[in-house]
Amino acid sequence: CPVNWLEYEGSCYWFSRSGKSWPEADKYCQLESAHLVVVNSREEQKFIQHHMGPVNTWMGLTDQSGPWKWVDGTDYETGFKNWRPEQPDDWYGHGLGGGEDCAHFTDDGRWNDDVCQRPYRWVCEAARDPAT
């Protein structure tokens, strides 16, 4: 994995320490030849949780196009899910217009949907370079 990236089960992970909106975080990961993290298992969830700290952190899951979709095409319907109770709730009460269309890890690691413009930390994921 590149310097400052962590390896886990054949993937490399980079944990931000600053905040960006979901679209900006998504773009940042793409520019690093990566994508916002896609959580495929309870074990991967635990790994991410251990390294991210107890703060809201964007992941690569969004319903900005209608259905919930992982950014790498992983099937949401059959895949791992770890929503907080009562979530996702597409809350309109924030008063910003529209609901909540982007998913993030909460302080306890479970997921919540929120307004995509919130400046949260984020995690990038990339396949490990077999040559390294």
Partner: antibody, heavy 117, light 107 residues
Framework: EVQLVESGGGLVKPGGSLRLSCAAS????????MNWVRQAPGKGLEWVSS????????YYADSVKGRFTISRDNAKNSLYLQMNSLRAEDTAVYFC??????????WGQGTLVTVSS | DIQMTQSPSSLSASVGDRVTITCRAS??????LNWYQQKPGKAPKLLIY???SLQSGVPSRFSGSGSGTDFTLTISSLQPEDFATYYC?????????FGPGTKVDIK
């Protein structure tokens, strides 16, 4: 395949009650807000009610507030609309639809409710 | 509540024509504007969401634009299957509201 199928429509007298159902399949039902939209004969679309995935948030059009109740059973992948104190102006095709701020998709085929004496 | 208006209420056009339908909101809805197509006896079909995003499976001749209060649905080259009624809908805040519709029929 993502699919919604409504049922429960029919003929009812003014002041009567009816319960509509919408059976969902092909997606994780609890992850989505659901909606009821109606269309009176020869008229346009009217939003009726919405409910969030876990029923935490519920919204109604003023025209049905206090008379209609939206609910869902995520274990049964089903959405409901309990309609009480029905009026002639409630006569319409009732559609259920998935979604929220990014639009409603898909829609069911609709079920006709006729309120007449 | 946010009121939605559409113009024209109906229009006659020929196959191949460029068709434009406008939708206006009574207050700013940023980009939370969706367009639907409905054919007689059928359920509405989502065409465009958040003003300009083309719904999956919808032909590219359909496009949407606008923000704030003024929005446009354009059909670049009308096809026989496009004769239908078109509705705009705001999803900025509750209660959600639809426009009255625009019927597109054959000239």
């Amino acid at each position: 395949e993502v699919q919604l199928v409504e049922s429960g429509g029919g003929l009812v007298k003014p002041g009567g009650s009816l319960r509509l159902s919408c059976a969902a399949s092909g997606f994780t039902f609890s992850s989505y807000s659901m909606n009821w939209v109606r269309q009176a004969p020869g008229k346009g679309l009217e939003w009726v009610s919405s409910i969030s995935g876990s029923s935490s948030y519920i919204y109604y059009a003023d025209s049905v507030k206090g008379r209609f109740t939206i609910s869902r059973d995520n274990a049964k992948n089903s959405l409901y609309l309990q309609m009480n104190s029905l009026r002639a102006e409630d006569t319409a095709v009732y559609f259920c639809a998935r979604g929220g701020s990014r639009g409603f998709d898909p829609w069911g085929q609709g079920t006709l409710v006729t309120v007449s004496s | 509540d946010i009121q939605m208006t559409q113009s024209p209420s109906s229009l006659s056009a020929s196959v191949g024509d460029r068709v434009t339908i406008t939708c206006r909101a009574s207050q700013s809805i940023t980009s939370y504007l969706n367009w639907y197509q409905q054919k007689p006896g059928k359920a509405p079909k989502l065409l465009i969401y958040t003003a300009s995003s083309l719904q999956s499976g919808v032909p590219s001749r359909f496009s949407g634009s606008g923000s704030g209060t003024d929005f446009t649905l354009t059909i670049s080259s009308l096809q026989p299957e496009d004769f239908a009624t078109y509705y705009c809908q705001q999803s900025h805040s509750f209660p959600f509201t639809f426009g009255p519709g625009t019927k597109v029929d054959i000239k």
